[in-house]
């Protein structure tokens, strides 16, 4: 089965009036920023800021633009050929294994460890053992074990929609 839909935000949206901008498919495909018509004879432009397509395609509709959640900032807006790019707010990050939400960065490393990497929108602070220099597994330590370094920015969890 082909995995087509990558967006998580899947509520039906109100469709604007049909676009008039049309062209003919090339070898059965329409260019980025377009989808194919029901009869396969025309390419119909996606609606700027509403939907998009990134590749040559024979999709019967354009994909819906992601909307950044609260707790995320918009790095670049949705165009007809590119989805919105959202990033976690300062002090939060998104892990590859839990991409649906921004998690708060830890404010410090466990006792016996030293911070070697800062909080970024895509990674928590990085801690290594003082002696061995091996990385910490990433489990959040118990509160009493935490050595505070710099205060983190509180942020509510944010769900990924793109």
């Amino acid at each position: 089965e082909s995995a087509l839909i990558t967006q998580q935000d899947l509520a039906p949206q109100q469709r604007a009036a049909p676009q008039q901008k049309r062209s003919s498919p090339s070898e059965g495909l329409c260019p980025p920023g377009h989808h194919i018509s029901e009869d396969g004879r025309d390419c119909i432009s996606c609606k700027y800021g509403q939907d998009y397509s990134t590749h040559w395609n024979d999709l019967l509709f354009c994909l819906r633009c992601t909307r950044c959640d609260s707790g995320e900032v918009e790095l670049s807006p949705c165009t007809t050929t590119r989805n919105t790019v959202c990033q976690c707010e300062e002090g939060t990050f998104r892990e590859e294994d839990s991409p649906e939400m921004c998690r708060k960065c830890r404010t410090g490393c466990p006792r016996g460890m030293v911070k070697v990497g800062d909080c970024t929108p895509w990674s928590d602070i990085e801690c290594v053992h003082k002696e061995s220099g091996t990385k910490h597994s990433g489990e959040v330590p118990a509160v009493e074990e935490t050595v505070t370094s710099s205060p983190g920015t509180p942020a509510s969890p944010c769900s990924l929609s793109g």
Partner: antibody
């Protein structure tokens, strides 16, 4: 395993409306169109239209506009078809069927429901 | 709408025989993209139709290789090389080149 499970038979009076359902399982519900077909007794099949669970769009065979209304409930991965102002001509077996979102592979139905028999009689 | 005409209406065969079903369309089914969107389904008694062949000659997954499709333009054929008991039922052709999509009237394959 892909399955489309339809609701049971219906006996309805002329002039009334009826809503039949098609529960999808075994695949990503939002990844395919849901189509509806009509098979009148001893006759061939007619394509009624299709619903796009991803964005809520519908596309109807002109013949069935005003007769059929297609909807889905994404939370229960169930497609519905409401048939309005019923007459004896609407008595038939109705099937749901899945098709792809792409033009080149979207014109055939790779999986079908078992059918729902509708009888319109006073 | 494109009218799909199937012949024969009924096809009595003996098990092991070859069967051939014809489907003719009122307009060419060759799309402007060069592809032909003609498909075949089998509906066994008391069941829903099942996809056999898509786009003239492509067997759907799990369909035995005794089924084959051919044709072009407006004339198409479904062949079953050696009919088995499980092949009995009504065969429908359908087209998706032109909107609305339409089906043939069906050919009933039965035991002679």
């Amino acid at each position: 395993e892909v399955q489309l499970q339809q609701s049971g038979p219906e006996l309805v009076k002329p002039g009334a409306s009826v809503k039949i359902s098609c529960k999808a399982s075994g695949y990503s519900f939002i990844g395919y169109f849901m189509n509806w077909m009509k098979q009148s007794h001893g006759k061939s099949l007619e394509w009624i239209g299709r619903f796009n669970p991803y964005n809520g769009d519908t596309f109807y065979n002109q013949k069935f506009k005003g007769k059929a209304t297609l909807t889905v409930d994404k939370s229960s991965t169930t497609a519905h078809m409401e048939l309005l102002s019923l007459t004896s001509e609407d008595s038939a077996v109705y099937f749901c069927g899945r098709s792809a979102y792409y033009f080149d592979s979207g014109g055939y139905f790779d999986y079908w429901g078992q059918g729902t028999t509708l009888t319109v009689s006073s | 709408d494109v009218v799909m005409t199937q012949t024969p209406l009924s096809l009595p065969v003996s098990l092991g025989d070859q069967a051939s079903i014809s489907c003719r369309s009122s307009q060419s089914l060759v799309h402007s993209n060069g592809n032909t969107y003609l498909h075949w389904y089998l509906q066994k008694p008391g069941q829903s139709p099942k996809l056999l062949i898509y786009k003239v000659s492509n067997r759907f997954s799990g369909v035995p290789d005794r089924f084959s499709g051919s044709g072009s333009g407006t004339d198409f054929t479904l062949k079953i090389s050696r009919v088995e008991a499980e092949d009995l039922g009504i065969y429908f052709c359908s087209q998706s080149t032109h909107v609305p999509w339409t089906f043939g009237g069906g050919t009933k394959l039965e035991i002679k």
